[in-house]
Protein backbone atom coordinates (compact mmCIF):
# COMPACT_ATOMS: atom_id res chain seq x y z
CA UNK A 1 0.00 0.00 0.00
CA UNK A 2 1.22 3.63 -0.63
CA UNK A 3 -0.29 7.29 0.56
CA UNK A 4 -1.36 7.57 -2.77
CA UNK A 5 -3.91 4.93 -2.90
CA UNK A 6 -7.75 6.37 -3.01
CA UNK A 7 -9.54 7.99 -0.18
CA UNK A 8 -12.17 10.05 0.21
CA UNK A 9 -15.02 11.95 0.71
CA UNK A 10 -17.70 14.71 0.74
CA UNK A 11 -16.18 17.51 2.79
CA UNK A 12 -19.83 18.93 3.72
CA UNK A 13 -20.70 16.46 5.28
CA UNK A 14 -17.84 14.47 5.93
CA UNK A 15 -14.96 16.77 7.42
CA UNK A 16 -13.01 14.07 9.11
CA UNK A 17 -12.25 12.38 5.27
CA UNK A 18 -12.22 15.84 3.77
CA UNK A 19 -8.42 15.72 3.82
CA UNK A 20 -7.62 11.66 3.02
CA UNK A 21 -7.90 12.83 -0.69
CA UNK A 22 -4.73 11.13 -2.77
CA UNK A 23 -1.56 12.88 -3.41
CA UNK A 24 -1.69 11.55 -7.02
CA UNK A 25 -3.81 9.45 -8.98
CA UNK A 26 -5.09 6.28 -7.07
CA UNK A 27 -4.25 2.82 -7.84
CA UNK A 28 -7.35 1.13 -8.78
CA UNK A 29 -8.62 -1.08 -6.21
CA UNK A 30 -5.61 -1.93 -4.68
CA UNK A 31 -4.94 -3.42 -0.91
CA UNK A 32 -4.43 -1.39 2.35
CA UNK A 33 -1.15 -1.64 3.94
CA UNK A 34 -2.38 -4.71 7.15
CA UNK A 35 -5.28 -6.02 5.50
CA UNK A 36 -6.09 -9.03 3.70
CA UNK A 37 -8.23 -8.70 0.28
CA UNK A 38 -9.91 -10.47 -2.13
CA UNK A 39 -11.45 -9.05 -5.04
CA UNK A 40 -13.37 -12.02 -5.90
CA UNK A 41 -14.67 -12.19 -2.21
CA UNK A 42 -15.13 -8.42 -2.73
CA UNK A 43 -14.27 -8.57 1.03
CA UNK A 44 -11.14 -6.75 3.18
CA UNK A 45 -10.37 -8.25 6.25
CA UNK A 46 -8.13 -6.00 8.61
CA UNK A 47 -8.24 -7.81 11.79
CA UNK A 48 -6.13 -7.53 15.07
CA UNK A 49 -3.94 -4.79 13.81
CA UNK A 50 -4.12 -2.18 16.43
CA UNK A 51 -5.34 0.06 13.73
CA UNK A 52 -6.13 3.17 15.14
CA UNK A 53 -8.32 5.13 12.07
CA UNK A 54 -10.33 3.09 9.82
CA UNK A 55 -8.17 2.88 6.49
CA UNK A 56 -8.61 5.71 3.72
CA UNK A 57 -7.30 3.53 0.85
CA UNK A 58 -10.38 0.84 0.70
CA UNK A 59 -11.04 -0.67 -2.69
CA UNK A 60 -13.78 0.55 -4.00
CA UNK A 61 -15.01 -3.23 -4.62
CA UNK A 62 -15.19 -3.52 -0.94
CA UNK A 63 -18.85 -5.36 -0.06
CA UNK A 64 -17.70 -6.92 3.28
CA UNK A 65 -15.31 -5.20 5.63
CA UNK A 66 -14.15 -6.81 8.95
CA UNK A 67 -12.27 -3.65 10.75
CA UNK A 68 -12.55 -6.80 14.35
CA UNK A 69 -10.28 -6.50 16.89
CA UNK A 70 -8.40 -2.94 16.56
CA UNK A 71 -8.36 -0.03 18.67
CA UNK A 72 -10.63 2.35 16.88
CA UNK A 73 -11.98 4.63 19.95
CA UNK A 74 -13.97 7.23 18.06
CA UNK A 75 -15.83 6.89 14.36
CA UNK A 76 -16.43 10.24 13.57
CA UNK A 77 -18.80 11.80 11.04
CA UNK A 78 -17.98 10.55 7.47
CA UNK A 79 -15.64 7.69 9.01
CA UNK A 80 -16.42 5.43 5.55
CA UNK A 81 -17.16 8.64 3.40
CA UNK A 82 -14.85 8.07 0.16
CA UNK A 83 -14.97 9.43 -3.08
CA UNK A 84 -15.96 7.80 -5.12
CA UNK A 85 -18.14 6.31 -2.52
CA UNK A 86 -18.22 2.54 -1.28
CA UNK A 87 -20.89 2.14 -3.13
CA UNK A 88 -21.02 -1.35 -2.73
CA UNK A 89 -20.05 -2.10 1.06
CA UNK A 90 -23.29 -4.17 2.17
CA UNK A 91 -21.61 -5.92 5.52
CA UNK A 92 -19.49 -4.09 8.22
CA UNK A 93 -18.13 -5.65 11.18
CA UNK A 94 -16.14 -3.59 13.97
CA UNK A 95 -16.98 -5.97 16.53
CA UNK A 96 -14.28 -5.71 19.65
CA UNK A 97 -12.81 -2.76 18.29
CA UNK A 98 -12.67 -0.41 21.80
CA UNK A 99 -14.97 2.34 20.16
CA UNK A 100 -16.22 4.21 22.82
CA UNK A 101 -17.61 6.86 20.71
CA UNK A 102 -19.74 7.13 17.38
CA UNK A 103 -21.08 10.26 16.42
CA UNK A 104 -23.38 11.79 14.26
CA UNK A 105 -23.40 10.17 10.66
CA UNK A 106 -20.88 8.04 11.10
CA UNK A 107 -22.13 5.48 8.64
CA UNK A 108 -23.12 8.37 6.23
CA UNK A 109 -22.62 7.50 2.46
CA UNK A 110 -22.74 3.97 2.50
CA UNK A 111 -25.91 3.17 0.06
CA UNK A 112 -25.54 -0.74 0.22
CA UNK A 113 -24.94 -1.23 4.16
CA UNK A 114 -27.72 -3.93 5.10
CA UNK A 115 -25.26 -5.22 8.39
CA UNK A 116 -23.19 -3.23 11.01
CA UNK A 117 -22.17 -5.21 13.35
CA UNK A 118 -20.60 -2.98 16.00
CA UNK A 119 -20.51 -5.63 19.41
CA UNK A 120 -17.89 -5.81 22.09
CA UNK A 121 -17.10 -2.63 22.28
CA UNK A 122 -17.79 -0.20 25.03
CA UNK A 123 -20.00 2.47 23.92
CA UNK A 124 -19.98 5.15 26.06
CA UNK A 125 -21.25 7.89 24.08
CA UNK A 126 -23.31 6.62 20.82
CA UNK A 127 -24.66 9.57 19.42
CA UNK A 128 -28.74 9.66 18.50
CA UNK A 129 -27.51 10.67 14.82
CA UNK A 130 -25.59 7.62 14.41
CA UNK A 131 -27.09 5.44 12.01
CA UNK A 132 -29.48 8.27 10.81
CA UNK A 133 -26.71 10.58 10.35
CA UNK A 134 -29.21 13.79 10.76
CA UNK A 135 -30.86 15.52 13.45
CA UNK A 136 -34.04 16.03 11.47
CA UNK A 137 -37.23 14.66 12.75
CA UNK A 138 -37.60 12.13 9.72
CA UNK A 139 -34.34 11.32 8.11
CA UNK A 140 -33.75 9.79 5.00
CA UNK A 141 -34.49 5.69 5.07
CA UNK A 142 -31.40 3.61 6.25
CA UNK A 143 -30.54 0.81 4.16
CA UNK A 144 -29.65 -1.23 7.25
CA UNK A 145 -31.39 -4.64 7.39
CA UNK A 146 -29.09 -5.91 10.52
CA UNK A 147 -27.70 -4.57 13.54
CA UNK A 148 -26.04 -6.29 15.78
CA UNK A 149 -25.12 -4.67 19.60
CA UNK A 150 -24.28 -7.10 21.46
CA UNK A 151 -22.51 -6.43 24.71
CA UNK A 152 -21.78 -2.74 23.86
CA UNK A 153 -22.62 -1.57 27.11
CA UNK A 154 -19.10 0.16 28.91
CA UNK A 155 -17.88 -0.82 31.79
CA UNK A 156 -20.10 1.24 35.37
CA UNK A 157 -17.67 3.49 36.21
CA UNK A 158 -17.28 4.88 32.13
CA UNK A 159 -21.25 5.22 31.84
CA UNK A 160 -22.45 8.54 31.80
CA UNK A 161 -25.35 9.77 34.17
CA UNK A 162 -27.76 8.28 31.69
CA UNK A 163 -29.75 6.33 30.93
CA UNK A 164 -27.78 3.39 29.14
CA UNK A 165 -30.98 2.02 27.23
CA UNK A 166 -32.16 5.53 26.86
CA UNK A 167 -28.84 6.11 24.85
CA UNK A 168 -29.55 2.93 22.46
CA UNK A 169 -33.31 3.46 21.84
CA UNK A 170 -32.53 7.56 21.07
CA UNK A 171 -30.02 5.90 18.29
CA UNK A 172 -32.18 2.96 17.01
CA UNK A 173 -35.62 5.87 16.54
CA UNK A 174 -33.88 9.11 15.63
CA UNK A 175 -35.82 10.64 12.38
CA UNK A 176 -37.44 7.03 11.77
CA UNK A 177 -34.36 5.86 9.84
CA UNK A 178 -34.54 2.11 10.75
CA UNK A 179 -38.17 1.65 9.59
CA UNK A 180 -36.55 -1.24 6.76
CA UNK A 181 -34.63 -3.26 10.72
CA UNK A 182 -35.37 -6.94 9.90
CA UNK A 183 -32.31 -7.93 12.42
CA UNK A 184 -31.46 -6.27 15.77
CA UNK A 185 -29.42 -7.67 18.36
CA UNK A 186 -29.08 -6.30 22.06
CA UNK A 187 -27.69 -8.99 24.02
CA UNK A 188 -25.32 -9.13 26.47
CA UNK A 189 -26.04 -5.28 27.47
CA UNK A 190 -27.20 -5.30 31.32
CA UNK A 191 -30.74 -4.13 30.05
CA UNK A 192 -33.35 -3.47 32.86
CA UNK A 193 -36.00 -2.02 30.68
CA UNK A 194 -37.24 -1.91 27.40
CA UNK A 195 -38.31 1.41 26.68
CA UNK A 196 -41.89 0.96 25.67
CA UNK A 197 -41.45 2.92 22.29
CA UNK A 198 -38.81 0.59 20.93
CA UNK A 199 -40.35 -1.85 19.10
CA UNK A 200 -43.34 -0.15 18.02
CA UNK A 201 -41.11 2.21 15.44
CA UNK A 202 -38.94 -0.92 13.88
CA UNK A 203 -42.01 -2.54 12.74
CA UNK A 204 -39.83 -4.38 10.28
CA UNK A 205 -38.34 -6.88 12.69
CA UNK A 206 -37.90 -10.50 12.21
CA UNK A 207 -35.54 -11.03 14.53
CA UNK A 208 -34.80 -9.27 17.95
CA UNK A 209 -31.89 -10.94 20.66
CA UNK A 210 -32.65 -9.17 24.22
CA UNK A 211 -31.28 -12.69 25.84
CA UNK A 212 -28.33 -12.07 28.73
CA UNK A 213 -30.23 -8.76 29.93
CA UNK A 214 -31.77 -8.38 33.24
CA UNK A 215 -34.97 -7.79 32.03
CA UNK A 216 -37.44 -7.40 35.06
CA UNK A 217 -40.48 -7.33 33.20
CA UNK A 218 -42.36 -6.87 29.85
CA UNK A 219 -45.49 -5.27 31.22
CA UNK A 220 -45.07 -1.85 29.47
CA UNK A 221 -43.67 -3.28 26.10
CA UNK A 222 -45.98 -3.37 23.11
CA UNK A 223 -45.31 -6.52 20.43
CA UNK A 224 -48.76 -5.80 18.67
CA UNK A 225 -47.17 -3.88 15.70
CA UNK A 226 -44.36 -6.35 15.17
CA UNK A 227 -46.37 -8.28 12.84
CA UNK A 228 -43.46 -10.03 11.16
CA UNK A 229 -41.43 -10.88 14.09
CA UNK A 230 -39.95 -14.56 13.97
CA UNK A 231 -37.91 -14.71 16.41
CA UNK A 232 -38.08 -13.13 19.95
CA UNK A 233 -34.77 -13.88 22.10
CA UNK A 234 -35.26 -13.45 26.01
CA UNK A 235 -33.20 -16.03 27.80
CA UNK A 236 -31.11 -15.51 30.64
CA UNK A 237 -33.10 -12.19 31.81
CA UNK A 238 -34.45 -11.61 35.25
CA UNK A 239 -38.17 -12.25 33.81
CA UNK A 240 -40.47 -13.49 36.93
CA UNK A 241 -43.41 -14.08 35.12
CA UNK A 242 -45.31 -13.01 31.98
CA UNK A 243 -48.89 -11.13 31.52
CA UNK A 244 -51.83 -11.98 30.13
CA UNK A 245 -51.41 -8.97 28.02
CA UNK A 246 -48.07 -9.97 26.84
CA UNK A 247 -49.22 -13.75 26.39
CA UNK A 248 -52.00 -12.33 24.07
CA UNK A 249 -49.69 -10.40 21.93
CA UNK A 250 -46.90 -13.22 21.36
CA UNK A 251 -49.88 -15.33 20.27
CA UNK A 252 -51.04 -13.04 18.50
CA UNK A 253 -48.12 -12.70 15.89
CA UNK A 254 -48.41 -15.39 13.18
CA UNK A 255 -44.60 -16.44 13.08
CA UNK A 256 -43.10 -16.37 16.41
CA UNK A 257 -40.77 -18.18 18.05
CA UNK A 258 -40.44 -17.04 22.10
CA UNK A 259 -36.99 -18.40 23.48
CA UNK A 260 -37.52 -18.04 27.48
CA UNK A 261 -34.66 -20.20 28.97
CA UNK A 262 -32.50 -19.24 32.05
CA UNK A 263 -35.29 -16.70 33.50
CA UNK A 264 -36.01 -16.51 37.17
CA UNK A 265 -39.41 -17.45 36.95
CA UNK A 266 -41.64 -16.78 39.78
CA UNK A 267 -43.86 -19.64 40.39
CA UNK A 268 -46.98 -18.06 42.66
CA UNK A 269 -50.49 -16.98 42.34
CA UNK A 270 -49.46 -14.64 39.67
CA UNK A 271 -47.64 -17.76 37.40
CA UNK A 272 -51.38 -19.35 36.71
CA UNK A 273 -52.25 -17.68 33.25
CA UNK A 274 -48.91 -18.23 32.26
CA UNK A 275 -48.72 -21.61 32.92
CA UNK A 276 -51.82 -22.24 31.33
CA UNK A 277 -50.69 -20.39 27.73
CA UNK A 278 -47.62 -22.61 28.27
CA UNK A 279 -49.42 -25.65 28.03
CA UNK A 280 -51.25 -24.57 24.79
CA UNK A 281 -48.84 -22.77 23.31
CA UNK A 282 -46.83 -23.50 20.22
CA UNK A 283 -44.87 -20.45 20.33
CA UNK A 284 -42.37 -21.09 23.53
CA UNK A 285 -39.49 -23.12 21.83
CA UNK A 286 -38.30 -25.45 24.37
CA UNK A 287 -40.78 -24.36 26.75
CA UNK A 288 -40.39 -28.09 28.87
CA UNK A 289 -37.03 -26.62 29.91
CA UNK A 290 -38.49 -23.58 32.04
CA UNK A 291 -38.77 -23.87 35.47
CA UNK A 292 -39.23 -22.19 39.17
CA UNK A 293 -36.80 -20.10 40.61
CA UNK A 294 -39.02 -18.85 43.11
CA UNK A 295 -40.25 -19.81 45.96
CA UNK A 296 -37.95 -21.88 47.38
CA UNK A 297 -40.27 -24.89 47.98
CA UNK A 298 -41.12 -24.51 44.05
CA UNK A 299 -37.31 -24.16 43.27
CA UNK A 300 -36.42 -25.96 39.47
CA UNK A 301 -40.05 -27.38 39.44
CA UNK A 302 -41.25 -27.50 35.35
CA UNK A 303 -43.77 -25.03 34.88
CA UNK A 304 -45.14 -27.56 32.67
CA UNK A 305 -45.84 -29.52 35.20
CA UNK A 306 -47.32 -26.82 37.50
CA UNK A 307 -51.52 -26.54 38.36
CA UNK A 308 -53.65 -24.28 39.45
CA UNK A 309 -53.20 -25.69 43.14
CA UNK A 310 -49.42 -25.54 43.02
CA UNK A 311 -49.50 -21.88 42.04
CA UNK A 312 -50.39 -20.10 46.04
CA UNK A 313 -49.61 -16.79 47.32
CA UNK A 314 -48.72 -16.32 50.90
CA UNK A 315 -51.76 -14.42 52.10
CA UNK A 316 -50.92 -10.59 52.74
CA UNK A 317 -51.31 -10.08 56.39
CA UNK A 318 -52.92 -7.22 57.96
CA UNK A 319 -50.84 -4.72 59.58
CA UNK A 320 -51.54 -5.71 62.79
CA UNK A 321 -50.95 -9.14 62.46
CA UNK A 322 -47.54 -8.12 60.68
CA UNK A 323 -44.38 -8.96 62.45
CA UNK A 324 -40.83 -6.88 61.78
CA UNK B 1 15.04 8.93 25.05
CA UNK B 2 12.64 9.39 22.08
CA UNK B 3 14.34 11.70 19.15
CA UNK B 4 12.83 12.84 15.89
CA UNK B 5 15.39 14.37 13.70
CA UNK B 6 14.28 16.37 10.21
CA UNK B 7 15.96 16.66 7.25
CA UNK B 8 16.09 17.45 3.26
CA UNK B 9 15.17 20.99 3.60
CA UNK B 10 16.72 24.42 1.79
CA UNK B 11 16.19 26.70 -0.71
CA UNK B 12 13.77 25.63 -3.63
CA UNK B 13 12.62 27.63 -6.89
CA UNK B 14 8.47 27.87 -7.17
CA UNK B 15 7.21 25.01 -8.83
CA UNK B 16 10.03 22.87 -7.19
CA UNK B 17 9.81 19.71 -5.41
CA UNK B 18 12.31 18.89 -2.12
CA UNK B 19 11.89 15.72 -0.42
CA UNK B 20 11.81 15.68 3.91
CA UNK B 21 13.15 12.96 6.19
CA UNK B 22 12.56 12.47 9.63
CA UNK B 23 14.42 9.63 11.59
CA UNK B 24 13.02 8.21 14.28
CA UNK B 25 14.34 6.48 17.47
CA UNK B 26 14.28 5.55 21.11
CA UNK B 27 10.69 4.26 21.14
CA UNK B 28 8.84 1.80 18.60
CA UNK B 29 8.29 3.46 15.94
CA UNK B 30 6.08 1.18 13.92
CA UNK B 31 3.63 1.78 16.92
CA UNK B 32 3.19 5.56 16.50
CA UNK B 33 1.00 7.26 14.02
CA UNK B 34 2.67 10.49 12.47
CA UNK B 35 2.51 13.79 11.60
CA UNK B 36 3.80 16.62 9.76
CA UNK B 37 3.34 20.31 10.99
CA UNK B 38 4.73 23.26 9.91
CA UNK B 39 5.63 27.12 10.93
CA UNK B 40 6.03 29.73 8.72
CA UNK B 41 8.26 32.84 9.95
CA UNK B 42 7.69 34.73 12.55
CA UNK B 43 3.39 32.26 12.39
CA UNK B 44 1.75 30.07 14.16
CA UNK B 45 1.57 26.08 14.12
CA UNK B 46 0.16 24.70 10.92
CA UNK B 47 -0.83 20.75 10.55
CA UNK B 48 0.19 19.31 7.08
CA UNK B 49 0.19 15.89 7.16
CA UNK B 50 -1.10 12.54 8.93
CA UNK B 51 0.30 8.97 8.37
CA UNK B 52 -1.20 6.09 10.57
CA UNK B 53 1.33 3.37 11.99
CA UNK B 54 0.97 1.05 9.79
CA UNK B 55 0.39 3.60 6.28
CA UNK B 56 -3.17 2.47 6.23
CA UNK B 57 -4.45 6.25 6.51
CA UNK B 58 -3.58 9.60 5.23
CA UNK B 59 -4.69 12.81 5.55
CA UNK B 60 -3.73 16.10 4.55
CA UNK B 61 -4.46 19.73 4.82
CA UNK B 62 -6.03 21.33 2.26
CA UNK B 63 -3.77 23.58 1.38
CA UNK B 64 -0.98 21.00 0.41
CA UNK B 65 -3.40 18.25 -0.87
CA UNK B 66 -2.94 16.79 -4.37
CA UNK B 67 0.91 18.43 -3.96
CA UNK B 68 2.70 16.65 -0.70
CA UNK B 69 2.94 12.65 -0.28
CA UNK B 70 3.25 11.97 3.40
CA UNK B 71 4.87 7.96 3.60
CA UNK B 72 7.31 5.96 6.00
CA UNK B 73 9.33 3.06 6.17
CA UNK B 74 9.15 1.49 9.50
CA UNK B 75 11.90 -0.98 8.70
CA UNK B 76 14.08 2.28 8.85
CA UNK B 77 12.33 3.80 11.56
CA UNK B 78 12.06 6.93 9.05
CA UNK B 79 8.62 9.23 7.94
CA UNK B 80 9.22 11.17 5.05
CA UNK B 81 7.01 14.22 2.95
CA UNK B 82 7.37 15.03 -0.67
CA UNK B 83 6.68 18.43 -1.51
CA UNK B 84 6.02 19.28 -5.12
CA UNK B 85 4.61 21.94 -6.60
CA UNK B 86 6.30 24.10 -3.84
CA UNK B 87 4.84 27.85 -3.75
CA UNK B 88 5.97 30.89 -1.69
CA UNK B 89 3.61 30.08 1.08
CA UNK B 90 5.21 26.99 1.74
CA UNK B 91 8.31 28.30 3.45
CA UNK B 92 8.54 27.09 6.99
CA UNK B 93 10.11 25.02 9.40
CA UNK B 94 8.64 21.53 9.08
CA UNK B 95 8.43 19.58 11.56
CA UNK B 96 7.82 15.98 12.64
CA UNK B 97 5.92 14.58 15.13
CA UNK B 98 4.26 11.83 16.93
CA UNK B 99 0.92 10.55 17.91
CA UNK B 100 -1.02 7.73 19.10
CA UNK B 101 -3.88 8.23 17.51
CA UNK B 102 -5.38 10.77 15.18
CA UNK B 103 -8.39 11.91 16.81
CA UNK B 104 -7.93 10.65 20.63
CA UNK B 105 -4.19 11.53 20.05
CA UNK B 106 -1.56 14.85 20.25
CA UNK B 107 1.37 15.54 19.38
CA UNK B 108 3.91 14.23 22.38
CA UNK B 109 7.46 14.49 20.82
CA UNK B 110 8.81 16.68 18.23
CA UNK B 111 11.77 17.16 16.26
CA UNK B 112 13.89 20.53 15.88
CA UNK B 113 12.77 20.94 12.43
CA UNK B 114 13.83 21.58 8.95
CA UNK B 115 13.56 24.87 7.38
CA UNK B 116 12.24 24.87 4.06
CA UNK B 117 12.29 28.29 1.61
CA UNK B 118 10.58 28.79 -1.56
CA UNK B 119 11.89 31.60 -3.47
CA UNK B 120 12.59 32.82 -6.59
CA UNK C 1 -12.91 23.74 9.38
CA UNK C 2 -12.57 24.55 13.57
CA UNK C 3 -11.62 27.81 14.23
CA UNK C 4 -9.79 28.27 17.43
CA UNK C 5 -9.12 31.56 18.75
CA UNK C 6 -6.56 32.20 21.53
CA UNK C 7 -6.92 35.20 24.17
CA UNK C 8 -4.96 37.27 24.89
CA UNK C 9 -2.42 37.15 21.94
CA UNK C 10 -0.01 38.75 24.52
CA UNK C 11 0.00 38.68 28.17
CA UNK C 12 2.42 40.00 30.75
CA UNK C 13 2.53 38.83 34.27
CA UNK C 14 4.96 38.93 37.16
CA UNK C 15 7.33 36.39 38.65
CA UNK C 16 5.23 34.22 41.09
CA UNK C 17 2.06 35.76 39.68
CA UNK C 18 -1.12 33.56 38.18
CA UNK C 19 -0.96 33.81 34.16
CA UNK C 20 -4.50 32.74 32.22
CA UNK C 21 -4.88 31.96 28.79
CA UNK C 22 -8.14 31.47 27.27
CA UNK C 23 -9.17 29.57 24.15
CA UNK C 24 -12.42 29.72 22.19
CA UNK C 25 -13.22 26.43 19.75
CA UNK C 26 -15.50 27.38 17.01
CA UNK C 27 -17.54 24.64 17.82
CA UNK C 28 -17.38 21.93 20.81
CA UNK C 29 -14.54 19.54 21.10
CA UNK C 30 -16.04 17.41 23.69
CA UNK C 31 -17.89 14.41 23.58
CA UNK C 32 -18.99 12.74 26.93
CA UNK C 33 -16.16 10.33 26.47
CA UNK C 34 -13.37 12.55 25.25
CA UNK C 35 -12.13 15.77 25.23
CA UNK C 36 -10.15 16.90 21.92
CA UNK C 37 -7.99 20.03 23.34
CA UNK C 38 -4.48 19.97 23.83
CA UNK C 39 -1.88 22.84 24.92
CA UNK C 40 1.91 23.31 23.91
CA UNK C 41 4.65 25.53 24.71
CA UNK C 42 7.21 26.67 22.31
CA UNK C 43 9.94 28.82 23.63
CA UNK C 44 11.74 30.60 21.25
CA UNK C 45 14.06 29.09 18.72
CA UNK C 46 12.56 25.78 19.91
CA UNK C 47 10.11 22.93 18.99
CA UNK C 48 6.62 23.17 20.71
CA UNK C 49 6.59 20.82 24.12
CA UNK C 50 2.78 19.13 25.10
CA UNK C 51 1.97 20.26 28.18
CA UNK C 52 -1.91 19.21 28.70
CA UNK C 53 -3.60 16.65 26.82
CA UNK C 54 -7.38 16.30 26.99
CA UNK C 55 -7.85 19.40 28.43
CA UNK C 56 -6.90 18.85 31.94
CA UNK C 57 -4.54 15.85 31.67
CA UNK C 58 -0.52 16.90 32.33
CA UNK C 59 1.89 15.54 30.15
CA UNK C 60 4.53 13.55 32.28
CA UNK C 61 7.37 15.78 33.14
CA UNK C 62 5.81 18.71 33.02
CA UNK C 63 5.57 21.22 36.39
CA UNK C 64 2.51 20.92 38.33
CA UNK C 65 1.83 25.22 38.54
CA UNK C 66 0.54 23.96 34.39
CA UNK C 67 -3.27 23.75 34.73
CA UNK C 68 -5.65 23.01 32.28
CA UNK C 69 -9.46 22.99 32.67
CA UNK C 70 -12.95 23.52 30.31
CA UNK C 71 -15.15 21.28 27.77
CA UNK C 72 -17.35 22.05 24.89
CA UNK C 73 -15.91 24.96 23.82
CA UNK C 74 -13.86 26.98 25.86
CA UNK C 75 -10.48 26.32 27.78
CA UNK C 76 -8.42 27.94 29.99
CA UNK C 77 -4.78 27.16 30.50
CA UNK C 78 -3.48 28.43 34.02
CA UNK C 79 0.20 28.74 35.59
CA UNK C 80 -0.27 29.50 38.83
CA UNK C 81 2.88 30.49 39.83
CA UNK C 82 5.05 32.30 36.62
CA UNK C 83 9.09 31.08 36.72
CA UNK C 84 10.83 33.09 34.24
CA UNK C 85 11.46 29.59 32.44
CA UNK C 86 7.80 29.93 31.64
CA UNK C 87 8.38 32.80 28.85
CA UNK C 88 6.80 31.43 25.70
CA UNK C 89 4.03 31.45 23.05
CA UNK C 90 1.23 28.56 24.00
CA UNK C 91 -1.08 27.35 21.59
CA UNK C 92 -3.83 25.44 22.01
CA UNK C 93 -4.89 22.89 19.63
CA UNK C 94 -8.03 20.54 18.45
CA UNK C 95 -8.14 17.17 17.56
CA UNK C 96 -12.14 16.80 16.84
CA UNK C 97 -11.72 15.93 13.58
CA UNK C 98 -9.53 16.89 10.36
CA UNK C 99 -7.82 19.37 9.23
CA UNK C 100 -6.62 19.58 12.88
CA UNK C 101 -5.89 23.39 13.86
CA UNK C 102 -3.83 25.29 15.96
CA UNK C 103 -4.98 28.72 17.91
CA UNK C 104 -2.88 31.62 16.60
CA UNK C 105 -0.63 31.73 20.02
CA UNK C 106 -0.57 33.55 22.91
CA UNK C 107 2.82 35.01 24.26
CA UNK C 108 3.87 35.18 27.89
CA UNK C 109 6.09 37.73 29.22
CA UNK C 110 7.71 38.81 32.52
CA UNK C 111 5.85 42.28 33.88
Known amino acids: SSPTSSASSFSSSAPFLASAVSAQPPLPDQCPALCECSEAARTVKCVNRNLTEVPTDLPAYVRNLFLTGNQLAVLPAGAFARRPPLAELAALNLSGSRLDEVRAGAFEHLPSLRQLDLSHNPLADLSPFAFSGSNASVSAPSPLVELILNHIVPPEDERQNRSFEGMVVAALLAGRALQGLRRLELASNHFLYLPRDVLAQLPSLRHLDLSNNSLVSLTYVSFRNLTHLESLHLEDNALKVLHNGTLAELQGLPHIRVFLDNNPWVCDCHMADMVTWLKETEVVQGKDRLTCAYPEKMRNRVLLELNSADLDCDPILPPSLQTS | EVQLVESGGGLVQPGGSLRLSCAAS????????MHWVRQAPGKGLEWVAY????????YYADTVKGRFTISRDNAKNSLYLQMNSLRDEDTAVYYC?????????????WGQGTTVTVSS | DIVMTQSPDSLAVSLGERATINCRAS??????????LHWYQQKPGQPPKLLIY???NLESGVPDRFSGSGSGTDFTLTISSLQAEDVAVYYC?????????FGQGTKLEIK
Open chain 2, 51 to 58: ISSGSTSF
Open chain 3, 93 to 101: QHSWEIPLT
Open chain 2, 97 to 109: SRTNSLLRGFFDA
Open chain 3, 27 to 36: QSVSSSSYTY
Open chain 3, 54 to 56: SAS
Open chain 2, 26 to 33: GFTFSNFG
